[in-house]
């Protein structure tokens, strides 16, 4: 609450996160023309990335384009991309939606469709839907430990969200354990009124707000965090503005002296930890 | 404008960026002693990195040191690094400019020059100029979509820069479309009074400032962002303070059971999105 | 000092860091049953990661699990994980401490111990202590150049910590050179009253605070940074809250068409650069 006689100062904050959990992923794997069910295990090194600062990312879904090589090939026949003659294809043209640079030739993509030939990583990425349900949907049961160190330099006061008295096997609960800083990802979504299973398909951004309202006067000292959660991406966003949260990254390798890559389109939840508040002192 | 009767609160912000574009790169490639022109395509997975938060990076230029292996070799003969006898080389010495640890021997680098032998990733990186013009100079035509969600917790008010009425095929223009949040990289530089082609060679840091001056009183409500752009690195910086923006990263691989790496010195533009402003309410 | 007649404005900041240094690492390497001493050189591309924003990370220690492959194997026999019969192992169970999903079988881990079989990256990571002394303990002698550009948009004032008059071969010293922005990592720790050699083993988080107290009135203009240092992680933290600073990442590769990875548990220092302060003008 506002104490007008106090000198207020904004918080200086540092955050450290640690995600725990394992996911079992079952997907169709095609090898030598034969498709069979493949089971694999994803641990933290597989589904999260070494990130600094106030964000962490958990991959919940993906689409792989394996064995791409730099060459010429027909582009993917998405809506409006098909052609019937070379006239439709413009040498040197880069369609922002496309994945390559047109050569000017119209070539067969498959038995029934023709598209403009491109210089690109081939075969070009298929623009297929993200798998539903999400491949790492069990990430709902992962947990994240959040460590937050705060400082009010003007008041020369430092504290942190984890106290020596805390129990490392706790799980945050708004009522029963509101000071525990280990959060189940599914609970964060539930608190924010969101459905993890649904968001995991396309990805999204979730805010974890840590609010410090600190009274630093010795006679009524209080300085503990309050956690709240809200979704930061727009779930009603128009297709053209790229709904959800995803990014592409590549694993490069050489095969018979040819540079190749596996392209991964990773969908997931980016968690932004937003720390704010003030320290007041007479 | 300042309304002294209002309670002002700083903005809490979350940013999500999405870069689009393809670059065609032409460079000299040497294979088995023969040098020929190589053409390659770079897409987002090749020139940008999965980054969180308020920054994104676009690689505009690079220098590669391929097939490095850990062994002994002569260091690169940069200014002041040449030697004529072992006396000039100090066993165990690590010159901050060098890339290895001296063995104490002075050995031939080429027909005319001798340098101190080092234990390092060999052959050591040649300290050659960044290619001019920049290899990915066409990145000027890439676009970035910036999504910004803001929150004034004290006023319990949330909004975002992208409204449902917006058109996903717009491009930001200071006069004609100042609310569009899709920016052409070249336009950002032009607005900041900078030359993209020039900065692309050595790299640099560009600030995209998003200013929210929000009046949250119902009778005169206004809360939309204002975008401005300014260069953040010092273009007049002394050589010793590392002008431009670059970093080195490595791709590791095994060949005949020997650990090797390709070292990439990546030059590029780091874009920092700086969100600030206040929300005022009676 | 507070000038009550001034209009104060918080600082908008952008940071760019550049780490320099080489480490020689000596460790035991086992190949074909023979253990010998291996020497290797780590340069910036090996021990740091391309990071944006107000953080940089320097790896000071590591534990490698080489050649892991997805299969079935006994889990690591940490405290409380051993079994004597299949009854102790629950098919489908994922222990948060474990690295895989139990199959329901109790199998020999070694001659004396049995553990639950898991589907995991095998062999599972041994939960061994971080090497002591730290493998890259010589990182104490690395240096970091910090470039900080600040802006007070309301006062339309911009400046940076590096001035044209500065000398690029300086090293920060609290008394002799308090404006130099090249810092020796060991000095940062000494200033913060911490022991680099000790922290390097388990890792930690170190804050570099840059305080700008700017008087922008023309008649008494002053706007230079003041640097201070403090440790941000809790060195007295309970084991259950994961003391120090580490993360796991993987290098993936294919061998005989089998997907493999080397898992690296990287310990190190994350440096958070915390910029704060105000600009005041009549």
């Amino acid at each position: 609450s506002d104490k007008l006689y106090q000198r207020k100062e904004p918080v200086i904050s540092s955050v450290h996160t640690k995600v725990k959990g394992i996911a079992e992923v079952t997907e169709n794997v095609t090898e030598g023309g034969v498709t069979k069910l493949g089971h694999s295990i994803f641990d933290t090194a597989d589904y999260t990335f070494p990130l600094q600062g106030n964000s962490f990312f958990v991959m919940t879904n993906y689409v792989k384009s394996e064995g791409q090589v730099q060459t010429l090939c027909p582009e993917y026949p998405r809506r409006g991309a098909q052609c019937s003659s070379d006239r439709r294809c413009k040498k040197g043209w880069m369609d922002p939606q496309s994945k390559g640079i047109q050569t000017g030739r119209c070539v067969p993509y498959d038995k029934t469709r023709k598209t403009c030939e491109v210089s690109a990583w081939c075969p070009t990425e298929e623009e297929k839907e993200a798998p539903r349900p999400a491949l790492l949907r069990s990430a709902e049961n992962f947990t994240v430990l959040i460590k937050n160190n705060i400082h009010f330099p003007g008041h020369n006061y430092t504290t942190r969200n984890i106290l020596p008295t805390m129990n490392g096997s706790c799980t945050f609960h708004k009522t029963w354990d509101p000071q525990c800083s280990i959060f189940r990802l599914g609970d964060i979504f539930q608190e924010a009124g969101e459905n993890f299973t649904e968001v995991a398909v396309q990805g999204g951004i979730m805010g974890i707000e840590i609010y410090w309202d600190c009274n630093l006067d010795s006679w009524s000292h209080h300085c503990r965090p309050r956690y709240s959660f809200r979704r930061l991406d727009d779930k009603n966003m128009d297709e053209s503005f790229v709904p959800g949260y995803n990014f592409r990254y590549a694993k490069y390798y050489k095969e018979n002296n040819v540079e190749k890559r596996t392209l991964i389109k990773a969908f997931g939840i980016r968690f932004d930890i937003l720390v704010f508040g003030t320290g007041g002192k007479f | 404008s300042d309304k002294l009767y209002q309670r002002k609160e700083p903005v809490i912000s979350s940013v999500h960026t999405k870069v689009k574009g393809i670059a065609e790169v032409t460079e000299n490639v040497t294979e088995g002693g023969v040098t020929k022109l190589g053409h390659s395509i770079f897409d987002t997975a090749d020139y940008t990195f999965p980054l969180q938060g308020n920054s994104f990076f676009v690689m505009t230029n690079y220098v590669k040191s391929e097939g490095q292996v850990q062994t002994l070799c002569p260091e690169y003969p940069r200014r002041g690094a040449q030697c004529s006898s072992d006396r000039r080389c100090k066993k165990g010495w690590m010159d901050p400019q060098s890339k290895g640890i001296q063995t104490g021997r002075c050995v031939p680098y080429d027909k005319t020059r001798k340098t101190c032998e080092v234990s390092a990733w060999c052959p050591t990186e040649e300290e050659k100029e960044a290619p001019r013009p920049a290899l990915l100079r066409s990145a000027e035509n890439f676009t970035v979509l910036i999504k910004n969600n803001i929150h004034f917790p004290g006023h319990n008010y949330t909004t975002r820069n992208i409204l449902p009425t917006m058109n996903g095929s717009c491009t930001f223009h200071k006069t004609w479309d100042p609310q569009c949040s899709i920016f052409r990289l070249g336009d950002i530089f032009q607005e900041a009074g900078e030359n993209f082609t020039e900065v692309a060679v050595q790299g640099g840091i560009m600030g995209i400032e998003i200013y929210w001056d929000c009046n949250l009183d119902s009778w005169s409500h206004h809360c939309r962002p204002r975008y401005s752009f300014r260069r953040l690195d010092d273009k007049n910086m002394d050589e010793s303070f590392v002008p431009g923006y670059n970093f080195r990263y490595a791709k590791y691989y095994k060949e005949n059971n020997v650990e090797k790496r390709t070292l990439i010195k990546a030059f590029g533009i780091r874009f920092d999105i700086l969100v600030f402003g206040t929300g005022g309410k009676f | 000092s507070d000038k009550l007649y001034q209009r104060k404005e918080p600082v908008i900041s952008s940071v760019h860091t550049k780490v320099k240094g080489i480490a020689e690492v000596t460790e035991n390497v086992t190949e074909g049953g023979v253990t010998k001493l291996g020497h290797s050189i780590f340069d910036t591309a090996d021990y740091t990661f391309p990071l944006q924003g107000n953080s940089f990370f320097v790896m000071t220690n590591y534990v490698k699990s080489e050649g892991q492959v997805q299969t079935l194997c006994p889990e690591y026999p940490r405290r409380g994980a051993q079994c004597s019969s299949d009854r102790r192992c629950k098919k489908g169970w994922m222990d948060p401490q474990s690295k895989g999903i139990q199959t329901g079988r109790c199998v020999p881990y070694d001659k004396t111990r049995k553990t639950c079989e898991v589907s995991a990256w095998c062999p599972t990571e041994e939960e061994k202590e971080a090497p002591r002394p730290a493998l890259l303990r010589s990182a104490e002698n690395f240096t970091v150049l910090i470039k900080n550009n600040i802006h007070f948009p309301g006062h339309n004032y911009t400046t940076r910590n590096i001035l044209p008059t500065m000398n690029g071969s300086c090293t920060f010293h609290k008394t002799w050179d308090p404006q130099c922005s090249i810092f020796r990592l060991g000095d940062i720790f000494q200033e913060a009253g911490e022991n680099f050699t000790e922290v390097a083993v388990q890792g930690g988080i170190m804050g570099i605070e840059i305080y700008w107290d700017c008087n922008l009135d023309s008649w008494s203009h002053h706007c230079r940074p003041r640097y201070s240092f403090r440790r941000l992680d809790d060195k007295n933290m309970d084991e259950s809250f994961v003391p120090g600073y580490n993360f796991r990442y993987a290098k993936y590769y294919k061998e005989n068409n089998v997907e493999k990875r080397t898992l690296i548990k990287a310990f190190g220092i994350r440096f958070d650069i915390l910029v704060f302060g105000t600009g005041g003008k009549f």
């Epitope: - | 059971n257 | 086992t30 190949e31 074909g32 049953g33 023979v34 080489e66 050649g67 892991q68 492959v69 299969t71 079935l72 194997c73 199998v107 020999p108 001659k111 079989e117 095998c122 062999p123 061998e255 005989n256 493999k260």
Partner: nanobody, 127 residues
């Protein structure tokens, strides 16, 4: 020093079976993974099958999967290879070896990870 002695080879018709044995002496091999390799005339030595130290996990080359079974008896310091439904392309000298490491799960098929090969036993499959 470890000695490995293979036995059980011979001439057999296509479709027939053989059981190879490998007796170890000089050191207990129960702490080590063990494997079978083979070398056909004019070809490189190739991995056939391997078993980890405890006998719980086994690995095979694709061409013998389902036909060959590797097993061990640690009490007798002996390794076995049961070969069924033999084919002409299985003709080779078969060697046993023990795994020196590191990391059996990843390197079970790499000849350089094994040491102390035996003298070998000839298997000939006539069609």
């Amino acid at each position: 020093e470890v000695q490995l002695v293979e036995s059980g080879g011979g001439l057999v018709q296509a479709g027939g079976s053989l059981r190879l044995s490998c007796a170890a002496s000089g050191r207990t091999v129960s702490d080590y993974g063990m494997g079978w390799f083979r070398q056909a005339p004019g070809k490189l030595r190739e991995f056939v099958a391997s078993i980890n130290w405890s006998g719980i996990y086994t690995r095979y080359i694709d061409s013998v999967e389902g036909r060959f079974t590797i097993s061990r008896d640690n009490t007798k310091n002996t390794l076995y290879l049961q070969m069924n439904n033999l084919k002409a392309e299985d003709t080779a000298v078969y060697y046993c070896a023990y795994f020196l490491g590191p990391n059996w799960y990843s390197n079970y098929g790499r000849p350089s990870s094994y040491g102390f090969y035996g003298q070998g036993t000839q298997v000939t499959v006539s069609s």
